[in-house]
Amino acid sequence: AQYTRPSNVSNIDVSTNTTAATLSWQNFDDASPTYSYCLLIEKAGNSSNATQVVTDIGITDATVTELIPGSSYTVEIFAQVGDGIKSLEPGRKSFCTDPASMASFDCEVVPKEPALVLKWTCPPGANAGFELEVSSGAWNNATHLESCSSENGTEYRTEVTYLNFSTSYNISITTVSCGKMAAPTRNTCTTGITDPPPPDGSPNITSVSHNSVKVKFSGFEASHGPIKAYAVILTTGEAGHPSADVLKYTYEDFKKGASDTYVTYLIRTEEKGRSQSLSEVLKYEIDVGNESTTLGYYNGKLEPLGSYRACVAGFTNITFHPQNKGLIDGAESYVSFSRYSDAVSLPQDVAAAHHHHHH
């Protein structure tokens, strides 16, 4: 049979997902119901590996599968009839498959830094980069991330800095390729904690009796993480700035003369039965010298006529020595200290003085 050459196809339309493209086209020849179509699909920059698809007669659409996400392809469509008589020119169309979304990403806190490290494996296929969005309340930030390669299963990471401590952030990462955007991948991540900001003031200390005092102080600001505990520290020495080293000393050490500074009382804030909001400042009032015990610290009687100053340690993380049961490990804790109070001098023991006088 004799056939006239088919005219070229036109109006090629492409719809894509990540690994497939559905193509449709038109041919306006009267004889087009007798045509089949030959499709050549070529990945950009890889002409040696073209995929060929031949349709059944009269079919003007085809789906090509096993494509690579986020990649650029060119399709050429020839109309053909009879013994392979083809249209002179193919219809041509370039298209991109949709980029693949990131499967997931992990967040890691950076110890003592208001930052998060995001980690992910590269999604399959090609990408031009990623859109990263971070938000918390009214604050938000959008940045671009560089492209990655999925070939070797490498773990990619980026650090998100200039955040706030102990704050929950919504994080979204969107893959981009060929000007297309994948469905975003989301996670909610919370930044870590650090030492609390030291308070401006110092505790208020007042004598109650010849062997006890009352220490009043305001709760520390919780902007660097929730305050987990407070330690009340007493000294009879020179009131320099306290260090974490003093947290290991107890009333017993003080009595033995091993230290002029010691921890007399420990408050675990969780025991108050409610969480403290950032702006809420709680007031604390501690009776020092009442012979109570909190963990490894004994709140022993004070010395009549002694001169005492008080200081408060606030903890966002309190760690105890594994071997010294109930004693704070200052080096492993997140702690800051108030300044020492002014000194208070205790009165003499009136009963003892009276007793002494009669003998």
Partner: antibody
């Protein structure tokens, strides 16, 4: 085929308000960062506002901050620009665009906003 | 804010000629540089993003190059349909900013 169609432009007096819309089709609108770009008559292009996909965070150029509000309705595949306290210098053709990785990829045909008394 | 300085302001080229348009950013923009073509009464069309990948359907006679602060658009084998105004644009930092444009005419 990606299609963006702006509407809502017109003549408005200084101090007045206008709400522009951009109807999107041919792509998954909810995945895309979107933006408004304007072009004053016979002038160059100027980015106006930008909105992210997932969390819907908005960014504005300083000259429109506090006066313009960009928003989106993913269910309707529509982008909006609410323009209040309009000034004569806001007179321009306003285009909506997709904006992956900081490049304005697909553009609408534009809608003209004229601010004049 | 990042300023984009585009040169030349205008140029005319003969059919088949090669032309170059330069764009200088006031600070490094990490290749987040796009080029657009705009014809009278039409919307801008993206040609190149990320400094050099050609957008879908853009003829291969267009090419982009550059890094850091300096970028250029090259059009080989000038065609009548290449007439228009060309803009560069940085998408690295808000506010995203455009060059003032280069008007390309056929001689």
């Amino acid at each position: 085929e990606v299609k963006l169609v702006e509407s809502g432009g017109g003549l408005v007096q200084p101090g007045g308000s206008l709400k522009l819309s951009c109807a999107a089709s041919g792509f998954t609108f909810s995945n895309y960062y979107m933006a408004w770009v304007r072009q004053a008559p016979t002038k160059g292009l100027e980015w106006v506002a930008y909105i992210t996909n997932s969390l819907g965070s908005a960014y504005y150029r300083d000259s429109v901050k506090g006066r313009f509000t960009i928003s989106r309705d993913n269910a309707k595949s529509t982008l909006y620009l609410q323009m209040d306290s309009l000034r004569s210098e806001d007179t321009a053709t306003y285009y909506c665009s997709t904006v992956p990785l900081g490049a304005f990829v697909y553009w609408g045909q534009g809608t003209l906003v004229t601010v004049s008394s | 804010d990042i300023q984009m300085t585009q040169t030349p302001h205008s140029l005319s080229a003969s059919l088949g000629e090669t032309v170059s348009i330069e764009c200088l950013a006031s600070e490094g923009i990490s290749n987040y540089l796009a080029w657009y073509q705009q014809k009278p009464g039409k919307s801008p069309q993206l040609l190149i993003s990320h400094a050099n990948p050609l957008h879908d359907g853009v003829p291969s006679r267009f090419s982009g190059s550059g890094s850091g602060t300096q970028y250029s658009l090259k059009i080989r084998n000038m065609q009548p349909e290449d007439e228009g105004v060309y803009y560069c644009q940085q998408g690295y930092k808000f506010p995203y900013s455009f060059g003032a444009g280069t008007k390309l005419e056929l001689k």
